[in-house]
């Protein structure tokens, strides 16, 4: 602790001029002050003022008034500084003497009198208000003040709390008049060394190094360090964890930059044509009739689909076509005949059989040839036979059709099966799902391929009920329940009018 | 007990960079009440005061070698290091680090033993 | 440029008080800390916040701060206080330290 005990001395009355052993001083009595502070002692005793001794020089002379002074000799008021904490309680001693000597240091001289001397013993407070007293004996009266304050930078009721002002990277404080800390605007902790970060700024992604700042620890961005960093190249996806890279609705790969959805994204198919998706960035387009190309964006000719019957030669217009018929026919698409078979209609050896009583005719056609007087060659691919997008080719007088890859058929209408590579070991059966195949295991194996001996049979307790079959290896549990007509349910045990589409998973 | 200890090398060439680490065992980097700070001693000289890093990469330096110093704090490894680029014989010294407490106003409790780094081509 | 001026040496004779003075700018209103280094080894830490002693220091040691100056008092010197002692304060966030004083004990 660290205070300073003030004594203001305000009037001395000497009107007589006498000493305390009843002689007069000659000319007046030149008055100075001795002040000894120590502990409080209910009876005052001789011995060392233990806090703190302190003289003035001549002040005046008999009777004076006692000026504030704040520098140099003859300060007032005096200063009796402590380095303890204050009790709160002391004894002073306050002696009046006359020197015949040497007015600034008047303690050296030889020949000093006593004139009088008071004796204050009691509590104070540390406080800035000043404590006003005075004291009279038979030939003199003293009027003086006093109050402990505590030394710069101490505080509290005894001086005994030290505490500094600061502002660095240690504390950014004021002093309360208790001595606490009181935390500059922006700061907090009990050193007022932690910076209030941006309000929101998140607890654990974030942090500050001065108020109102949000500074994101690796993996964490946004004005408030809430929001995670994907995975470095995660092109359509997003992240609940820093690095992560879940694929947005549509795309696949590590990075989600492979479009499973092309048709969806970038509608590459034209003309209202149909867009199917077939992988990663692949697609095929089924093209309405009159369109072709890769994406349709062709318009075929509209005479593309030889509409002319009869040998009719047909012409494009601007939004149609028009037949021009031979002679002998007549009608939008040359269908209506002049003819009979008395004008042999029919070529490339074509039968004609009379109809309607010989006012028309229709003609039968050998192989290959086709069209109402098998004037046409037949194209076999005209009726676009191969399916699941296959390429149709002439061949002389058949046609064959070229699959895509997972096709196969005549017409590419069988899909060739995950099954057919025979995934599922130790007598597994295979079914093919939209994922790919998955194989229900026979009793004692287990694993996506059946592959797993196991030791238990998780059907050996008979877990199925209404005569199913039991099956192990295709779930965690290691068994499923395939059900009999009218019977869903993990174990089939519900009735019902409804066949299970797959065997339900226990 | 919290143990502080210099490694690097002991001789530098003039104008290039000299790289110090300190590797704090006995206690956590990350610790809020601590600064992490480096100090040097010229032979026969008294101490300087180089700069200091909080465990969040909060960094202070002497402005008389702010410009060529750079601190680092790996807290991963309990570390926390000292580029000073640009040496010349001046810069011969022995550099201590140290930890300095809040709590302590700023007073360094712990020290490394030191290390000698010689500025001479 | 905050700077703390030591005397650069102190002589005492054994059992005697050596006081160590240290100055600067109004380094009352900022907090001092003491260090005391023998010869070959690391600075130990003696006296922080002014006067407090950390553990392990013994009361011998003291300081005291007010005005201009920062004292660091050993009373009952003995000769195995014989070292450098040095001062450091921080202004604003710069550390600073006083450049030393050898305190030798006599005899």
């Known amino acids: 602790g660290s205070g300073i005990f003030q004594l203001r001395l305000q009037e001395f009355v000497n009107q007589r001029g006498m000493l305390a052993n009843g002689q007069s001083c000659e000319p007046g009595c030149r008055t100075f002050f001795r002040i000894c502070l120590k502990h409080f002692q209910a009876t005052f005793s001789e011995g060392p003022c233990t806090f703190g001794n302190v003289s003035t020089p001549v002040l005046g002379t008999n009777s004076f008034v006692v000026r504030d002074k704040n520098s140099g000799s003859g300060r007032n008021p005096l200063q009796l500084p402590f380095n303890f904490t204050w009790p709160g309680t002391f004894s002073l001693n306050i002696q009046a003497w006359h020197t015949p000597g040497d007015d600034l240091r008047p303690e050296t001289s030889p020949g000093n009198s006593l004139i009088s001397q008071i004796i204050i013993q009691g509590s104070l407070a540390v406080g800035k208000i000043w404590r006003t007293d005075e004291q009279n004996d038979t030939l003199t009266r003293l009027s003086y003040s006093y109050r402990v304050i505590c030394s710069d930078n101490y505080y509290g009721e005894s001086c005994s709390r030290l505490c500094k002002k600061r502002d660095d990277h240690f504390g950014h404080y004021e002093c309360q008049p208790d001595g606490s800390l009181s935390c500059l605007p922006g700061w907090t902790g009990k050193y007022c060394d932690q910076p209030i970060c941006l309000s929101g700024c998140h607890e654990q992604n974030g942090y500050c190094s001065k108020p109102d700042e949000c500074i994101c620890r690796p993996g964490w961005q946004g004005r408030l360090c809430n929001e995670c960093i994907p995975h470095n190249g995660c092109r359509h996806g997003t992240c609940s964890i820093p690095w992560q890279c879940a694929c947005d609705e549509g795309w696949g790969g590590l990075f989600c930059d492979q479009d499973l959805n092309y048709c969806t994204h970038h509608s590459p198919c034209k003309n209202g044509s149909t867009c199917s998706n077939s992988g990663p960035k692949g697609y095929t387009c089924t093209c309405l009739p009159g369109y072709t190309g890769e994406h349709c964006e062709l318009g075929l000719s509209k005479c593309a689909s030889n509409p002319c019957r009869n040998g009719g030669s047909c012409k494009d217009q601007e939004n149609s076509y028009h037949c021009l018929c031979p002679p002998g026919y007549y009608g939008q698409h040359c269908e209506h005949s002049t003819l009979t078979c008395a004008d042999s209609p029919c070529f490339n050896g074509g039968s004609c059989r009379e109809r309607n009583q010989g006012s028309s005719y229709a003609c039968e056609c050998p192989p290959n040839f086709t069209g109402s007087n098998c004037e046409k060659k037949v194209d076999r691919c005209t009726s676009n036979p191969c399916a699941n997008g296959g390429q149709c080719q002439n061949r002389g007088p058949s046609r064959t059709c070229r699959c895509r890859p997972g096709f196969t058929g005549t017409h590419c209408e069988l899909h060739i099966s995950d099954c057919a590579r025979s995934p599922c070991a130790h007598g597994g059966t295979c079914h093919d799902l939209e994922n790919g195949p998955v194989c229900t295991c026979p009793a004692g194996f287990s694993g996506r391929r059946c592959e797993v001996r196991i030791t238990h049979d998780a059907c050996a307790s008979g877990p199925c009920f209404n005569g199913a079959t039991c099956y192990t290896g295709l779930s965690p549990n290691n068994f499923v329940c395939n059900c009999p007509y009218g019977f869903v349910g993990s174990r089939c045990e519900f009735p019902v009018g409804l066949p299970p589409s797959f065997p339900w998973v226990a | 007990e919290v143990q502080l200890q210099e490694s690097g090398p002991g001789l530098v060439k003039p104008s290039e960079t000299l790289s110090l680490t300190c590797t704090v065992s006995?206690?956590?980097?990350?610790?809020?009440?601590?600064?992490w700070g480096w100090i040097r001693q010229p032979p026969g000289k008294g101490l300087e005061w180089i700069g200091d890093?909080?465990?969040?990469?909060?960094?202070y330096y002497n402005p008389s070698l702010k410009s060529r110093v750079t601190i680092s704090v790996d807290t991963s490894k309990n570390q926390f290091s000292l580029k000073l680029s640009s040496v010349t014989a001046a810069d011969t010294a022995v550099y201590y680090c140290?930890?300095?407490?809040?709590?302590?106003?700023?007073?360094?409790?712990?020290w490394g033993q030191g290390t000698l780094v010689t500025v001479s081509s | 440029l905050y700077v703390l001026t030591q005397p650069p040496s102190v002589s005492v004779s054994p059992g005697q008080t050596a006081s160590i003075t240290c100055s600067g700018q109004?380094?009352?209103?900022?907090?001092a800390s003491w260090y005391q280094q023998k010869p070959g080894q690391s600075p130990v830490l003696v006296i922080y916040e002014d006067s407090k002693r950390p553990s392990g220091i013994p009361e011998r040691f003291s300081g005291s701060n007010s005005g201009d100056t920062a004292t660091l008092t050993i009373s009952g010197t003995q000769t195995m206080d014989e070292a450098d002692y040095l001062c450091?304060?921080?202004?604003?966030?710069?550390?600073?330290f006083g450049g030393g004083t050898k305190v030798t004990v006599l005899g």
């Open positions: 109004r380094l009352g209103d900022k907090y």
């Open positions: 140290a930890r300095e407490d809040v709590i302590l106003r700023g007073g360094s409790d712990y």
């Open positions: 006995g206690g956590s980097i990350s610790s809020s009440s601590y600064y």
């Open positions: 450091q304060a921080w202004d604003r966030d710069t550390g600073v």
């Open positions: 890093i909080y465990y969040t990469g909060s960094t």
